[in-house]
Protein backbone atom coordinates (compact mmCIF):
# COMPACT_ATOMS: atom_id res chain seq x y z
CA UNK A 1 0.00 0.00 0.00
CA UNK A 2 1.61 3.10 -1.13
CA UNK A 3 1.71 6.00 1.44
CA UNK A 4 -0.82 8.88 1.85
CA UNK A 5 0.25 12.16 -0.51
CA UNK A 6 -1.22 15.33 -0.18
CA UNK A 7 -1.69 17.31 -3.62
CA UNK A 8 -2.09 21.05 -4.18
CA UNK A 9 -2.45 21.02 -7.88
CA UNK A 10 -1.65 25.04 -7.86
CA UNK A 11 1.15 26.97 -7.10
CA UNK A 12 -1.11 30.11 -6.76
CA UNK A 13 -4.13 31.75 -7.29
CA UNK A 14 -5.30 35.17 -7.93
CA UNK A 15 -8.72 36.26 -6.74
CA UNK A 16 -9.89 39.78 -6.97
CA UNK A 17 -11.44 41.25 -3.76
CA UNK A 18 -14.08 40.46 -2.52
CA UNK A 19 -15.08 37.43 -4.53
CA UNK A 20 -14.11 33.48 -3.54
CA UNK A 21 -11.18 31.82 -3.64
CA UNK A 22 -11.01 28.48 -4.01
CA UNK A 23 -8.14 26.43 -2.71
CA UNK A 24 -7.66 22.49 -4.36
CA UNK A 25 -6.85 19.46 -2.02
CA UNK A 26 -6.70 15.70 -2.34
CA UNK A 27 -5.53 12.84 -0.62
CA UNK A 28 -3.89 9.95 -2.41
CA UNK A 29 -5.17 7.68 0.08
CA UNK A 30 -7.47 7.44 2.77
CA UNK A 31 -5.38 5.86 5.63
CA UNK A 32 -4.09 6.84 7.82
CA UNK A 33 -7.24 8.32 9.74
CA UNK A 34 -7.17 11.52 10.76
CA UNK A 35 -8.21 14.83 10.01
CA UNK A 36 -7.72 17.34 7.29
CA UNK A 37 -6.49 21.06 8.23
CA UNK A 38 -6.12 24.07 6.14
CA UNK A 39 -3.39 27.12 7.61
CA UNK A 40 -2.31 29.95 5.97
CA UNK A 41 1.46 30.21 6.80
CA UNK A 42 3.90 27.77 8.05
CA UNK A 43 5.47 27.13 11.26
CA UNK A 44 4.18 27.73 14.90
CA UNK A 45 2.45 30.77 14.55
CA UNK A 46 0.33 29.47 11.06
CA UNK A 47 -3.22 30.53 11.06
CA UNK A 48 -5.77 27.87 11.14
CA UNK A 49 -8.21 28.56 8.32
CA UNK A 50 -10.27 25.16 8.57
CA UNK A 51 -10.28 22.25 10.55
CA UNK A 52 -12.43 19.02 9.53
CA UNK A 53 -12.95 17.96 13.25
CA UNK A 54 -14.41 20.81 14.98
CA UNK A 55 -14.82 24.53 15.06
CA UNK A 56 -16.89 27.18 12.97
CA UNK A 57 -15.34 28.90 9.98
CA UNK A 58 -18.19 30.78 8.51
CA UNK A 59 -16.21 32.25 5.24
CA UNK A 60 -15.09 28.49 4.65
CA UNK A 61 -16.97 25.61 2.60
CA UNK A 62 -15.56 22.74 1.09
CA UNK A 63 -15.77 21.50 -2.19
CA UNK A 64 -17.25 18.57 -1.30
CA UNK A 65 -19.15 16.43 0.73
CA UNK A 66 -16.99 15.19 3.65
CA UNK A 67 -19.34 12.89 5.44
CA UNK A 68 -19.01 10.47 2.41
CA UNK A 69 -16.88 7.72 3.51
CA UNK A 70 -14.17 7.65 0.47
CA UNK A 71 -14.11 10.91 0.12
CA UNK A 72 -10.36 12.68 -0.56
CA UNK A 73 -10.91 15.69 -1.80
CA UNK A 74 -10.45 18.38 0.70
CA UNK A 75 -10.91 21.34 -1.22
CA UNK A 76 -11.91 24.25 0.08
CA UNK A 77 -13.60 27.79 -0.90
CA UNK A 78 -13.09 31.31 1.12
CA UNK A 79 -15.62 33.81 0.52
CA UNK A 80 -15.27 37.71 0.11
CA UNK A 81 -11.78 37.71 -0.08
CA UNK A 82 -9.78 40.85 1.37
CA UNK A 83 -6.22 41.79 0.66
CA UNK A 84 -5.41 40.55 4.21
CA UNK A 85 -6.29 37.13 3.38
CA UNK A 86 -3.10 36.86 0.67
CA UNK A 87 -0.49 34.16 1.70
CA UNK A 88 0.33 30.62 1.70
CA UNK A 89 -1.98 28.08 2.17
CA UNK A 90 -1.36 24.83 3.21
CA UNK A 91 -3.50 21.39 3.59
CA UNK A 92 -2.37 19.13 6.08
CA UNK A 93 -2.98 15.58 6.67
CA UNK A 94 -3.02 14.42 10.18
CA UNK A 95 -2.98 11.04 11.84
CA UNK A 96 -4.93 10.36 14.76
CA UNK A 97 -2.98 10.49 18.19
CA UNK A 98 -3.34 10.73 21.36
CA UNK A 99 -3.95 12.94 23.28
CA UNK A 100 -3.51 15.32 20.37
CA UNK A 101 -3.73 14.06 16.72
CA UNK A 102 -0.46 13.85 14.63
CA UNK A 103 0.91 16.02 11.27
CA UNK A 104 1.24 13.55 8.86
CA UNK A 105 1.45 14.95 5.48
CA UNK A 106 1.35 18.90 3.97
CA UNK A 107 0.71 19.40 0.70
CA UNK A 108 3.01 21.96 -1.16
CA UNK A 109 0.94 24.89 -0.63
CA UNK A 110 -0.97 27.30 -2.77
CA UNK A 111 -0.02 31.37 -2.83
CA UNK A 112 -3.75 33.20 -2.71
CA UNK A 113 -2.69 36.54 -4.53
CA UNK A 114 -5.36 39.22 -3.81
CA UNK A 115 -6.27 41.96 -6.98
CA UNK A 116 -8.16 44.91 -5.49
CA UNK A 117 -11.10 45.80 -6.82
CA UNK A 118 -11.02 49.10 -9.64
CA UNK A 119 -12.42 52.05 -8.14
CA UNK B 1 -31.03 19.55 22.16
CA UNK B 2 -30.24 17.27 19.99
CA UNK B 3 -33.24 14.71 19.37
CA UNK B 4 -33.91 12.08 17.17
CA UNK B 5 -37.50 9.92 16.84
CA UNK B 6 -37.71 7.17 15.33
CA UNK B 7 -41.38 5.63 13.85
CA UNK B 8 -42.78 2.82 11.95
CA UNK B 9 -41.76 -0.18 14.01
CA UNK B 10 -44.42 -3.06 14.56
CA UNK B 11 -45.59 -6.34 13.83
CA UNK B 12 -45.04 -7.79 10.19
CA UNK B 13 -45.47 -11.42 8.99
CA UNK B 14 -42.24 -12.64 7.05
CA UNK B 15 -41.67 -11.84 3.65
CA UNK B 16 -43.28 -8.53 4.18
CA UNK B 17 -41.68 -4.84 3.69
CA UNK B 18 -41.74 -1.78 6.32
CA UNK B 19 -40.77 1.43 6.31
CA UNK B 20 -39.03 2.88 9.06
CA UNK B 21 -38.74 7.06 9.48
CA UNK B 22 -36.32 8.97 11.99
CA UNK B 23 -37.53 12.71 12.83
CA UNK B 24 -34.52 14.88 13.55
CA UNK B 25 -34.50 18.06 15.14
CA UNK B 26 -31.88 20.35 17.31
CA UNK B 27 -29.30 20.11 15.00
CA UNK B 28 -28.36 21.14 10.73
CA UNK B 29 -29.39 17.89 9.57
CA UNK B 30 -28.35 18.53 6.07
CA UNK B 31 -24.64 18.59 7.33
CA UNK B 32 -24.51 15.22 8.97
CA UNK B 33 -23.91 11.86 7.83
CA UNK B 34 -26.78 9.35 9.67
CA UNK B 35 -26.68 5.72 10.39
CA UNK B 36 -29.28 2.90 11.27
CA UNK B 37 -28.17 0.15 14.33
CA UNK B 38 -30.31 -2.29 15.31
CA UNK B 39 -30.53 -4.70 18.74
CA UNK B 40 -32.22 -7.71 18.47
CA UNK B 41 -33.78 -9.00 21.98
CA UNK B 42 -30.91 -9.94 24.47
CA UNK B 43 -28.54 -9.44 21.87
CA UNK B 44 -25.96 -6.67 21.29
CA UNK B 45 -25.74 -3.74 18.79
CA UNK B 46 -25.43 -4.20 14.66
CA UNK B 47 -24.59 -1.73 12.73
CA UNK B 48 -26.93 -1.65 9.61
CA UNK B 49 -26.51 1.19 6.87
CA UNK B 50 -24.87 4.69 6.55
CA UNK B 51 -25.86 7.57 4.42
CA UNK B 52 -23.66 10.79 3.89
CA UNK B 53 -24.97 14.56 4.27
CA UNK B 54 -26.08 15.16 0.82
CA UNK B 55 -27.29 11.69 0.37
CA UNK B 56 -25.60 10.58 -2.41
CA UNK B 57 -23.38 7.98 -1.25
CA UNK B 58 -24.94 5.08 1.18
CA UNK B 59 -22.91 2.29 2.59
CA UNK B 60 -24.41 -1.31 4.02
CA UNK B 61 -23.44 -4.56 6.21
CA UNK B 62 -23.08 -7.10 3.64
CA UNK B 63 -26.47 -9.27 5.43
CA UNK B 64 -28.78 -6.46 4.58
CA UNK B 65 -27.49 -5.45 0.43
CA UNK B 66 -30.43 -5.37 -1.57
CA UNK B 67 -32.94 -6.23 1.12
CA UNK B 68 -32.40 -2.52 3.06
CA UNK B 69 -32.59 0.69 1.72
CA UNK B 70 -31.42 3.74 3.79
CA UNK B 71 -32.18 7.38 2.20
CA UNK B 72 -33.45 10.68 3.97
CA UNK B 73 -35.25 14.31 3.29
CA UNK B 74 -33.11 17.11 3.86
CA UNK B 75 -35.95 19.42 3.74
CA UNK B 76 -38.30 17.26 6.12
CA UNK B 77 -35.31 16.62 8.26
CA UNK B 78 -35.71 12.43 8.19
CA UNK B 79 -33.99 9.42 7.45
CA UNK B 80 -35.32 6.60 6.48
CA UNK B 81 -34.78 3.12 6.54
CA UNK B 82 -37.02 0.79 3.78
CA UNK B 83 -36.98 -2.92 4.50
CA UNK B 84 -38.11 -5.73 2.24
CA UNK B 85 -38.37 -9.28 2.60
CA UNK B 86 -38.47 -9.03 6.14
CA UNK B 87 -37.81 -12.43 8.66
CA UNK B 88 -37.79 -13.51 12.17
CA UNK B 89 -33.92 -12.44 12.49
CA UNK B 90 -34.97 -8.68 11.63
CA UNK B 91 -36.97 -8.49 14.85
CA UNK B 92 -34.87 -5.88 16.59
CA UNK B 93 -34.84 -2.88 18.39
CA UNK B 94 -34.14 -0.05 15.44
CA UNK B 95 -31.98 3.23 16.09
CA UNK B 96 -31.50 5.68 14.06
CA UNK B 97 -27.99 7.82 15.28
CA UNK B 98 -25.98 10.80 14.03
CA UNK B 99 -22.44 10.72 12.59
CA UNK B 100 -19.46 12.42 13.95
CA UNK B 101 -17.29 13.51 11.65
CA UNK B 102 -14.92 10.45 11.48
CA UNK B 103 -18.38 8.24 11.06
CA UNK B 104 -18.82 7.03 14.98
CA UNK B 105 -21.77 8.03 16.52
CA UNK B 106 -22.53 10.40 19.04
CA UNK B 107 -25.99 11.09 19.35
CA UNK B 108 -29.11 8.18 19.35
CA UNK B 109 -32.65 7.84 18.88
CA UNK B 110 -34.61 5.85 21.40
CA UNK B 111 -35.52 2.85 19.02
CA UNK B 112 -38.74 1.56 17.70
CA UNK B 113 -39.09 -1.90 18.01
CA UNK B 114 -39.76 -3.97 14.77
CA UNK B 115 -41.73 -7.87 14.95
CA UNK B 116 -41.27 -10.37 12.75
CA UNK B 117 -43.58 -13.15 13.16
CA UNK B 118 -46.36 -15.27 11.36
CA UNK C 1 -13.58 -6.61 7.97
CA UNK C 2 -12.97 -6.80 11.75
CA UNK C 3 -13.82 -8.35 14.64
CA UNK C 4 -13.86 -6.33 17.84
CA UNK C 5 -13.59 -8.37 20.83
CA UNK C 6 -14.35 -7.33 24.76
CA UNK C 7 -14.65 -9.22 28.27
CA UNK C 8 -18.17 -10.12 28.74
CA UNK C 9 -18.76 -8.90 32.26
CA UNK C 10 -16.36 -6.87 34.42
CA UNK C 11 -17.28 -6.60 38.20
CA UNK C 12 -16.15 -3.29 40.94
CA UNK C 13 -16.72 -2.48 43.89
CA UNK C 14 -18.01 1.72 44.16
CA UNK C 15 -15.09 3.87 44.14
CA UNK C 16 -12.82 1.49 42.98
CA UNK C 17 -11.83 2.08 38.74
CA UNK C 18 -13.27 -0.26 35.88
CA UNK C 19 -11.44 -1.18 33.09
CA UNK C 20 -13.06 -2.79 29.98
CA UNK C 21 -10.77 -3.63 26.78
CA UNK C 22 -11.68 -3.88 23.45
CA UNK C 23 -9.06 -5.42 21.05
CA UNK C 24 -9.39 -5.66 17.31
CA UNK C 25 -8.81 -3.60 13.86
CA UNK C 26 -6.23 -1.46 12.65
CA UNK C 27 -4.98 1.52 14.60
CA UNK C 28 -3.75 3.73 11.77
CA UNK C 29 -7.41 2.65 9.69
CA UNK C 30 -9.87 2.94 12.34
CA UNK C 31 -11.81 5.16 15.07
CA UNK C 32 -13.06 4.11 18.39
CA UNK C 33 -15.88 4.96 20.57
CA UNK C 34 -17.97 3.36 23.96
CA UNK C 35 -21.55 3.36 24.56
CA UNK C 36 -23.16 2.71 27.20
CA UNK C 37 -26.41 1.34 27.60
CA UNK C 38 -28.83 0.65 30.49
CA UNK C 39 -31.49 -1.93 30.36
CA UNK C 40 -34.56 -0.76 28.35
CA UNK C 41 -32.92 2.38 27.25
CA UNK C 42 -30.92 3.86 24.19
CA UNK C 43 -27.21 3.81 23.79
CA UNK C 44 -25.48 6.80 25.06
CA UNK C 45 -22.03 8.14 23.89
CA UNK C 46 -19.56 8.18 26.15
CA UNK C 47 -16.11 8.12 24.38
CA UNK C 48 -15.77 8.65 20.80
CA UNK C 49 -12.52 9.46 18.51
CA UNK C 50 -10.38 6.90 21.06
CA UNK C 51 -10.57 9.34 23.83
CA UNK C 52 -12.89 12.12 23.42
CA UNK C 53 -15.72 12.26 26.20
CA UNK C 54 -18.60 14.49 25.25
CA UNK C 55 -19.47 17.77 27.22
CA UNK C 56 -22.30 15.88 28.89
CA UNK C 57 -20.37 12.76 30.27
CA UNK C 58 -18.68 12.69 33.98
CA UNK C 59 -15.50 13.24 34.05
CA UNK C 60 -14.75 10.12 35.54
CA UNK C 61 -14.99 8.36 32.35
CA UNK C 62 -12.09 8.02 30.20
CA UNK C 63 -10.63 6.47 27.13
CA UNK C 64 -7.44 5.26 25.66
CA UNK C 65 -5.38 3.14 22.85
CA UNK C 66 -2.18 0.85 22.20
CA UNK C 67 -1.98 -0.49 19.47
CA UNK C 68 -4.71 -2.51 18.59
CA UNK C 69 -6.55 -2.44 21.93
CA UNK C 70 -8.81 0.49 23.45
CA UNK C 71 -9.50 1.07 27.23
CA UNK C 72 -12.50 2.50 28.84
CA UNK C 73 -11.46 3.63 32.36
CA UNK C 74 -14.48 4.56 34.86
CA UNK C 75 -12.71 6.43 37.55
CA UNK C 76 -14.52 5.87 41.47
CA UNK C 77 -17.55 3.93 39.72
CA UNK C 78 -21.00 4.66 40.70
CA UNK C 79 -23.84 2.43 41.10
CA UNK C 80 -25.58 4.32 38.30
CA UNK C 81 -22.49 3.59 36.18
CA UNK C 82 -23.90 -0.23 36.22
CA UNK C 83 -24.77 -1.01 32.37
CA UNK C 84 -24.08 -2.55 29.93
CA UNK C 85 -20.64 -1.27 27.70
CA UNK C 86 -20.12 -1.38 23.72
CA UNK C 87 -17.27 -0.56 21.86
CA UNK C 88 -17.78 0.48 18.22
CA UNK C 89 -15.19 1.11 15.58
CA UNK C 90 -15.10 2.45 12.16
CA UNK C 91 -12.65 0.99 9.46
CA UNK C 92 -11.40 3.64 6.78
CA UNK C 93 -10.44 0.99 5.18
CA UNK C 94 -13.91 -0.74 4.39
CA UNK C 95 -16.14 2.00 5.06
CA UNK C 96 -18.02 -0.40 7.76
CA UNK C 97 -18.71 -0.03 11.51
CA UNK C 98 -18.70 -2.62 13.93
CA UNK C 99 -19.57 -3.22 17.60
CA UNK C 100 -17.96 -5.77 20.08
CA UNK C 101 -20.43 -8.08 21.70
CA UNK C 102 -20.55 -5.73 24.79
CA UNK C 103 -19.22 -5.83 28.47
CA UNK C 104 -21.86 -5.76 31.34
CA UNK C 105 -20.67 -4.03 33.76
CA UNK C 106 -21.54 -4.76 37.84
CA UNK C 107 -21.27 -2.56 40.67
CA UNK C 108 -21.15 -5.01 43.39
Known amino acids: EEELQVIQPDKSVLVAAGETATLRCTATSLIPVGPIQWFRGAGPGRELIYNQKEGHFPRVTTVSDLTKRNNMDFSIRIGNITPADAGTYYCVKFRKGSPDDVEFKSGAGTELSVRAKPS | DVQLVESGGGVVRPGESLRLSCAASGFTFSSYAMSWVRQAPGKGLEWLAGISAGGSDTYYIDSVKGRFTISRDNPKNSLYLQMSSLTAEDTAVYYC???????????WGLGTLVTVSS | SYELTQPPSVSVSPGQTARITCSGG??????YAWYQQKPGQAPVTVIHSDDKRPSDIPERFSGSSSGTTVTLTISGVQAEDEADYYCGGYDGRTYINTFGGGTKLTVL
Open chain 2, 97 to 107: ARETWNHLFDY
Open chain 3, 26 to 31: DYYSTY
